[in-house]
Interface confidence: low
């Protein structure tokens, strides 16, 4: 708490300007009117205040707005945002995407802080759903944002928002998250033609079921090995050798390098060796020729 002292004669601030950087902390407290500060917040960013001076300015705003800052002040917080605690931010009601962008800009280049996480949470909850414009903004600043959400939170993402998602936004998503996102992507891109559709859906395929992979194998998509390796093992296992060959196209030769890794390893174990031999890649570990293959659902139960 800064001690209350009278403002020295002639030092009362009429404007928020560079002269204030020469004020001591107690002079800022005594001589800067909180209401003036609130109306001229946009000037604070252009003035090289010390962190200690910013603490005083924050304290003045806290006193003026004990229930939380209005959006007109929040939008112009600039570097003062870095001084806010999650508790401060929980009092805010941020509805404008421009305000959100302005604050994310301040934190740009840094990991998502608890303050930013709280701000985003408040904003999204206020909007009721993660709409396309919001998602576009958040993933631009934090490519990993989408994958930081729980499957439950992702379920509120409307399919129309999927158009804002870039492949790198999904890099850290786990299979449970892709299980939620894939059906939304499928719906969002359903009216695109074959090659365009595959370009868009490719990043989401870690959530695709077997029947969709079978359908893709009929469309000459030439899936790369990196994408194939991210597919759900349970979705890959029922695919035949011919289907995988069609799905991968010229990339099928990459199976050899991945034969010890899932899902390729598990898939090999489910194929007849003579079928694998038709690929000419020297893949080993398939079901020996002449062996009886049990019904696959039965095989699952026995394993």
């Amino acid at each position: 708490e800064v001690e209350k002292t009278a403002c020295p004669s002639g030092k009362k601030a009429r404007e928020i300007d560079e002269s204030l950087i020469f004020y001591k902390k107690w002079e800022l407290e005594a001589c800067v009117d909180a209401a003036l500060l609130a109306t001229q917040m946009d000037r604070v960013n252009a003035i090289p205040f010390t962190y200690e001076q910013l603490d005083v300015l924050k304290h003045k705003l806290d006193e003026l707005y004990p229930q939380g800052y209005p959006e007109s002040v929040i939008q112009h917080l600039g570097y003062l945002f870095l001084k806010m605690s999650p508790e401060d931010i929980r009092k805010w009601n941020v509805t404008s995407l421009e305000t959100l962008k302005a604050l994310l800009e301040v934190n740009k280049g840094h990991e998502m802080s608890p303050q930013v996480a709280t701000l985003i949470d408040r904003f999204v909850k206020g909007r009721g759903q993660l709409d396309k414009d919001t998602l576009d903004t958040l993933t631009a600043f934090y490519p990993g944002y989408l994958c930081s959400l729980s499957p439950e939170e992702l379920s509120s993402v409307p399919p129309s928002s999927i158009w804002a998602v870039r492949p790198q936004d999904l890099d850290t998503c786990d299979p449970r998250q892709l299980d939620v996102l894939y059906p939304k992507a499928r719906l969002a891109f359903q009216n695109m033609n074959g090659s365009e559709y595959f370009v868009k859906i490719q990043s989401f395929l870690g959530g695709a079921p077997t029947e969709d992979l079978k359908a893709l194998s009929q469309q000459n998509v030439s899936m790369d090995l990196a994408t194939f390796m991210k597919l759900r093992t349970d979705a890959v296992l029922p695919l035949t050798v011919a289907e995988v060959q069609k799905l991968l196209g010229p990339h099928v030769e990459g199976l050899k390098a991945e034969e010890r890794h899932r899902p390729v390893r598990d898939w090999i174990l489910r194929q007849r060796q003579d079928d694998l031999d038709t690929l000419g890649l020297g893949l080993q570990g398939g079901i020996p020729n002449g062996y009886l293959v049990l019904d696959l659902s039965m095989q699952e139960a026995l394993s």
Partner: antibody
Framework: QLQLQESGPGLVKPSETLSLTCTVS??????????WGWIRQPPGKGLEWIGS???????FYSPSLKSRLNISVDTSKKQFSLKLSSVTAADTAVYYC????????????WGQGTLVTVSS | EIVMTQSPATLSVSPGERATLSCRAS??????LAWYLQKPGQAPRLLIY???TRATGIPARFSGSGSGTEFTLTISSLQSEDFAVYYC???????????FGQGTKLEIK
Amino acid sequence: QLQLQESGPGLVKPSETLSLTCTVSGGSISSSSYYWGWIRQPPGKGLEWIGSVYYSGSAFYSPSLKSRLNISVDTSKKQFSLKLSSVTAADTAVYYCARRPYKSGLFDFWGQGTLVTVSS
Amino acid sequence: EIVMTQSPATLSVSPGERATLSCRASQSVSSNLAWYLQKPGQAPRLLIYGTSTRATGIPARFSGSGSGTEFTLTISSLQSEDFAVYYCQQYNTWPPEYTFGQGTKLEIK
């Protein structure tokens, strides 16, 4: 007015590393709307895309150059850089830096280019 | 990779006349195709993107058409400043693997 300016040595010896920097002025390199790319053009020949980088540092490389290539960004200096290792005479070209919108793969703004010759 | 083939390699046309340049993709690139103009000693300049949308500041005499694998750039009435090399570029692939055509040189007849 956006300007892109390539800089770096004009002569590199075979087997060494070619290093170029592009400085962005009159605009923000940290814009979430753009990637920053490199394209090259051997003397008298056509254009070849090398790679692109986002302000977060994520990059995409041409498959044919990937094993020798590194593209990075330094937002504080408003620069992005290209490093191509183990160069040969075939890497002699005019190297351009350019901007591309992140939702599209076209190049809407280019630097004036810098000629790099690989020779002993 | 997708190979882009431009034709003809050189096109001789008189000022004021119409010029038609072709670009063919080895597989469909949808409408994700751009055209660039390059004058000697200068960097390329974006003319057209999305097959038919003119870039900012590009005159209406430039127009693009096509889809899939066949594309055309038309210059309706050639001006002296239009004589240059023209390149097409596809940007349909993911991961990005952008490829350019080998260029068409448009020269004064």
